[in-house]
Interface confidence: medium
C-alpha cells in the first residue's frame, strides 16, 4: 500500500518537520520558524502553540513537535495539555469566584488546588476519630470503641526520642 | 555563524566512485534539506541532489542513477557518492544549506567547494 | 527540466553603471527563482531568493524582480566588487536549474 500511495502521492515523501508544497509541484520545504509537523506527508505546517502570560514554556517548538506549556508559580496546570492556568490557594482553602476561601468547617483541602471535601465520617465505619480534622487535614479514624479494652489508651505515646540523662551527641 | 567544509579525494579514477563529505559547522545540521552541486572548471552550475536530516532525499534525474546522498546528524555531517565516474565529472563540487524555508530552497550558505578530477 | 536562460551572456560596463541582468525560465515558476553571484575562485553567493527578497547583508543595490516566466537582477550603481558572474536558479520543480550565467566585466 505504501509503494502505492507513494506513486500516487509525492507529498508521502515528505519527513516530519516539513510540508508538501503545493505552489511548487509538491516539493518538501521544511516547515516555517515557529511551525511544525510531527508526521511526514503533511500538506501545511501547524502553528507552534505559544507559552504566554500565565503560562510558562515546558518545552520548546521544534520543526517536528509542538512546544508543552506549564504554569507560573502561584498556578497550576487544568485541562488536557495545561489548557488553562488556575490560581494556586493554600491548603486549607478552596477558589472560589471571589478567591481563595479557608474551608468551612467540616471540611478541608490538603492540596494547593481542588476543592475543599467533607472530612471522613468515621461512624459510618463503626470507627472512632482517632485525630481530629483540620482544614489542611482530614480526620485519622481509629479503630472503633468496642475494640478498645478498658483502660487502654486509643492513642499510642511516642517512643522517646533519647535516653533521659544523655546529652546529644 | 554556519559553515559548510567539504573533504575527500581531489583524484578519483574512471569507473571509480567518488566519495565527498560535508561538515556542518557554527550550527546545527538538522530541521534544513542540504544540497551538493557542481561546478565544471569554466561552465555552469549544475544541482546533484539534496538530502533532509531524517534522510529525505531528491536527485537529479539526470545523475540519480549512480547518485547516494547519507547523513550523519551526530557527526554534522552529510555525504555524496556518485558511482561510475568518467571524465565528464571532473569538477569543483559545492555542499550549500538548502531549504530554510525563509529563503524558499535558495542556498544561503555554500562551502569553499573541491576540486575533484577524474583521471587515471 | 525546466530550462533557464540568461541575457545577456556577458556585459562590460563602468563603475557606477546601471547594470541589468534577465532571467528567463521555459515554464512558469511563479517567485521561485534566486541571484547568485560568483567571483572566480569563489563560491557562489546568495544575493536575492523569491525573485525579490535581498538576502542579510547584500547591499541595497542588489534588486530583483518578475514572476512567472520572466525576471531582472538590476544593479544600480556598479561598484568595483561587483565585476563577476551572476548566475540565476529556480526552485519551482525538481531538478533545480540554475542558469548559463552573465558575466560582467570592466568596460
Known amino acids: 500500500f505504501e509503494r502505492t500511495r507513494s506513486l500516487q502521492d509525492p507529498c508521502s515523501n515528505c519527513p516530519a518537520g516539513t510540508f508538501c508544497d503545493n505552489n511548487r509541484n509538491q516539493i518538501c520545504s521544511p516547515c516555517p520558524p515557529n511551525s511544525f509537523s510531527s508526521a511526514g506527508g503533511q500538506r501545511t505546517c501547524d502553528i507552534c502553540r505559544q507559552c504566554k502570560g500565565v503560562f510558562r514554556t515546558r518545552k520548546e517548538c521544534s520543526s517536528t513537535s509542538n512546544a508543552e506549556c506549564d504554569c507560573t508559580p502561584g498556578f497550576h496546570c487544568l485541562g488536557a495539555g495545561c489548557s488553562m492556568c488556575e490560581q494556586d490557594c493554600k491548603q486549607g482553602q478552596e477558589l472560589t469566584k471571589k478567591g481563595c476561601k479557608d474551608c468551612c468547617f467540616g471540611t478541608f483541602n490538603d492540596q494547593k488546588r481542588g476543592i475543599c471535601r467533607p472530612w471522613t465520617n468515621c461512624s459510618l465505619d463503626g470507627k472512632s476519630v482517632l485525630v481530629n480534622g483540620t482544614k489542611e487535614r482530614d480526620v485519622v479514624c481509629g479503630p472503633s470503641p468496642a475494640d478498645l479494652s478498658p483502660g487502654a489508651s486509643s492513642v499510642t505515646p511516642p517512643a522517646p526520642a533519647r535516653e533521659p540523662g544523655h546529652s546529644p551527641q | 555563524q554556519v559553515q559548510l567544509q567539504e573533504s575527500g579525494p581531489g583524484l578519483v579514477k574512471p569507473s571509480e566512485t567518488l566519495s565527498l563529505n560535508c561538515t556542518v559547522s557554527?550550527?546545527?545540521?538538522?530541521?534544513?534539506?542540504w544540497s551538493w552541486i557542481r561546478q565544471p572548471a569554466g561552465k555552469g552550475l549544475e544541482w546533484i541532489g539534496r538530502?533532509?536530516?531524517?534522510?529525505?532525499?531528491n536527485y537529479n534525474p539526470s545523475l540519480k542513477s549512480r547518485v547516494t546522498m547519507s547523513v550523519d546528524t551526530s557527526k554534522n555531517q552529510f555525504s555524496l557518492k556518485l558511482t561510475s565516474v568518467t571524465a565528464a565529472d571532473t569538477a569543483v563540487y559545492y555542499c550549500?544549506?538548502?531549504?530554510?524555508?525563509?529563503?524558499?530552497?535558495?542556498?544561503?550558505?555554500w562551502g569553499q567547494g573541491t576540486m575533484v578530477t577524474v583521471s587515471s | 527540466d525546466i530550462q533557464m536562460t540568461q541575457s545577456p551572456s556577458s556585459v562590460s560596463a563602468s563603475v557606477g553603471d546601471r547594470v541589468t541582468i534577465t532571467c528567463r525560465a521555459s515554464?512558469?515558476?511563479?517567485?521561485?527563482l534566486a541571484w547568485f553571484q560568483q567571483i572566480p575562485g569563489k563560491a557562489p553567493k546568495l544575493l536575492i531568493y523569491?525573485?525579490?527578497g535581498l538576502q542579510s547583508g547584500v547591499p541595497s543595490r542588489f534588486s530583483g524582480s518578475g514572476s512567472g516566466t520572466d525576471f531582472t537582477l538590476t544593479i544600480s550603481s556598479l561598484q568595483p566588487e561587483d565585476f563577476a558572474t551572476y548566475y540565476c536558479?529556480?526552485?519551482?520543480?525538481?531538478?533545480?536549474?540554475f542558469g548559463p550565467g552573465t558575466k560582467v566585466d570592466i568596460k
Open positions: 515554464q512558469g515558476i511563479s517567485s521561485w
Open positions: 523569491t525573485a525579490s
Open positions: 557554527g550550527g546545527s545540521i538538522s530541521n534544513y534539506y
Open positions: 536558479q529556480q526552485t519551482n520543480s525538481f531538478p533545480f536549474t
Open positions: 550549500a544549506r538548502d531549504g530554510n524555508w525563509n529563503y524558499a530552497d535558495a542556498f544561503d550558505i
Open positions: 538530502i533532509y536530516t531524517s534522510g529525505n532525499t
